[in-house]
Interface confidence: low
């Protein structure tokens, strides 16, 4: 981006996406959190939000900071899911 990436601004804005996603996931019973088809619309909305917020502050998306934030959200909601039950891609360094 011409004006450069405002990483601080992005880290301030991304939690808004996380909160909106958490609010939506509150409608999904916890035992369904490993079934992506139950909340795919919410998840797509979340990823679109992170992309938009990154772009607003002049950052490319995806980027390491945004992916780190998304990984944190994955941990919060999907840490108990086996790989074959939820198909969400974490950054390569998250094994």
């Amino acid at each position: 981006r011409a004006g450069g990436c405002n990483e601080t601004g992005m880290l301030e804005r991304l939690p808004l996406c996380g909160k909106a996603f958490a609010d939506m996931m509150g409608k999904v019973d916890v035992w369904k959190w490993c079934n992506l088809s139950e909340f795919i619309v919410y998840y797509e909305s979340f990823t679109n939000c992170t992309e938009m917020e990154a772009n607003v502050v002049g950052c490319y998306w995806p980027n390491p900071l945004a992916q780190g934030f998304i990984t944190g959200i994955h941990r919060q909601f999907f840490s108990n899911c086996t790989v074959d039950r939820v198909h969400l891609e974490d950054p390569p360094d998250e094994v």
Epitope: A22, D23, K27, D29, V30
Partner: antibody, heavy 115, light 111 residues
Framework: QEQLEESEGGLFKPTDTLTLTCTVS????????LTWVRQAPGNGLEWIGA???????YYASWAKSRSTITRNTNENTVTLKMTSLTAADTATYFC?????????WGPGTLVTVSS | DGVMTQTPSSVSAAVGGTVTISCQSS????????LSWFQQKPGQPPKLLIY???KLESGVPDRFSGSGSGTQFTLTISGVQCDDAATYYC???????????FGGGTEVVVK
């Protein structure tokens, strides 16, 4: 061990406001929904409302206008506040973990509304 | 409004027999599977038996089973035991959360 316990009920007068607190242990309110259910003496179960893991609240249509469910995730408590009590609100009130898969219940507390 | 009509209100069964309890919903439950079954004994809180129409809750004997779809649901107790004497309730959740409701209950008497 996952447990819930409702605060003590007791005797209330018509028009009073009921405040019940559910204290949970062994699980996080940030992960699980918490539901309130009541049961009038000799009657069936009645869904009052719930608070989702996100903090969103949901109420039965009959309870919406006079019920408020709040939570304190730091203290692991959920509070049900019900205004304008009448004799019809006499019941055992239960808090329970979950929304439809409600699989951990408190023992219940008896609330009596009488003049 | 979401109304769960549960039948029968009372049923008697012999030990080893089969009991079938029905719940008819006035509208489709949320995601077509937000339907649970509970057992309650006097002086105790309810106990979850079945969730998502047919999934057996952990620790519940497999003589309990749930079935159904759309607006019609059934709880079956096969090989009834004395310990199964209780009142059973269905619970349906809907798109509009304010419609979430229990059925009226079915008392099961074991002879």
């Amino acid at each position: 061990q996952e447990q819930l316990e409702e605060s003590e009920g007791g005797l209330f007068k018509p028009t009073d406001t009921l405040t019940l607190t559910c204290t949970v242990s062994g699980f996080s309110l940030s992960v699980y929904a918490l539901t309130w259910v009541r049961q009038a003496p000799g009657n069936g179960l009645e869904w009052i409302g719930a608070i989702g893991n996100s903090g969103n609240t949901y109420y039965a249509s009959w309870a919406k206008s006079r019920s408020t469910i709040t939570r304190n995730t730091n203290e692991n408590t959920v509070t049900l506040k019900m205004t304008s009590l009448t004799a019809a609100d006499t019941a055992t009130y239960f808090c329970a973990r979950g929304y439809v898969r409600i699989n951990v219940w408190g023992p219940g507390t008896l609330v009596t509304v009488s003049s | 409004d979401g109304v769960m009509t549960q039948t029968p209100s009372s049923v008697s069964a012999a030990v080893g027999g089969t009991v079938t309890i029905s719940c008819q919903s006035s509208q489709s439950v949320y995601k077509n599977n937000y339907l649970s079954w509970f057992q309650q004994k006097p002086g105790q809180p309810p106990k979850l038996l079945i969730y998502e129409i047919s999934k057996l809750e952990s620790g519940v004997p497999d003589r309990f089973s749930g079935s159904g779809s759309g607006t019609q649901f059934t709880l079956t107790i096969s090989g009834v035991q004395c310990d199964d004497a209780a009142t059973y309730y269905c619970l349906g959740g809907y798109d509009d959360d304010s419609d979430t409701s229990f059925g009226g209950g079915t008392e099961v008497v074991v002879k």
